[in-house]
């Protein structure tokens, strides 16, 4: 899910009767993005 969007979450925006997640930030907090952004501290030994 890599894309150039920045890594921000301004909280939830409220609309009448519903809550909107800020700008669909799931991609920035996805497993795929975590793999791109950080090394696993203790990778499993082979």
């Amino acid at each position: 899910l890599a894309d150039p969007l920045d890594h921000r979450d301004a909280g939830d925006l409220w609309f009448p009767g519903e809550s909107e997640s800020f700008e669909d930030a799931h991609v920035e907090h996805s497993i795929s993005r975590s793999l791109l952004e950080g090394e696993i501290p203790f990778p499993p030994t082979s």
Epitope: L5, F15, E18, S21, H26, H29, S30, S34, L35, I40
Partner: antibody, heavy 114, light 112 residues
Framework: EVQLVETGGSLVQPGGSLKLTCATS????????LHWIRRSPEKQLEWVAQ??????????YYAESVKGRFIVSRDDSKTTIYLQMNNLKEEDTAIYYC?????WGQGVMVTVSS | DVVLTQAPLSVSVTPGESASISCRSS???????????LYWYLQKPGMSPHLLIY???NLASGIPDRFSGSGSETDFTLKISEVEPEDVGVYYC?????????FGAGTKLELK
Amino acid sequence: EVQLVETGGSLVQPGGSLKLTCATSGFPFSNVWLHWIRRSPEKQLEWVAQIKARSDNYATYYAESVKGRFIVSRDDSKTTIYLQMNNLKEEDTAIYYCTGLDYWGQGVMVTVSS
Amino acid sequence: DVVLTQAPLSVSVTPGESASISCRSSRSLLTSKGITSLYWYLQKPGMSPHLLIYRMSNLASGIPDRFSGSGSETDFTLKISEVEPEDVGVYYCAQFLVYPYTFGAGTKLELK
């Protein structure tokens, strides 16, 4: 290799409780938002709950159908999330998946029946 | 809740031919940043769902470019340009913008 492994599913009577566990590995866990999503016997997918990261104060969100009955939590030290299900109803019968929306676990069956 | 209406509910396709699945949202899924929060999944028989398309038109990792997503703010289409036997299963659209997050009812793709 990314893995999400759900356990804890079983047959339970209406009104009973169950705790599902999703053990993850293969990716940096702490900043990832994770969800529980279920597939009913009618093959409809339904989002159940979400838990955000520590940087988001572990914010949680629930479907109206489970609010007040289900609790999602996470243990960053164990790279695991949980779904505590109380006061179970027959309509909670489903395969429950742990997912980051991009990767999914294999699912675990929960059957609520008397 | 945001209602996602898929059509058709089932489709039968000859291998090598193209197939299109429609998904209509009851509200706009376009954010102020120009992101459209519409996702497509395929659930193959006996398997977990897996991601095909994210944010309306972005191909997920490892997905062949026979799959493509397009649409507007409320009307979306998944196209499979040349259907292969491995494409059989149930296709779901989903939105992850408005709580509660919702899925379409699914479109079952079968081979002729």
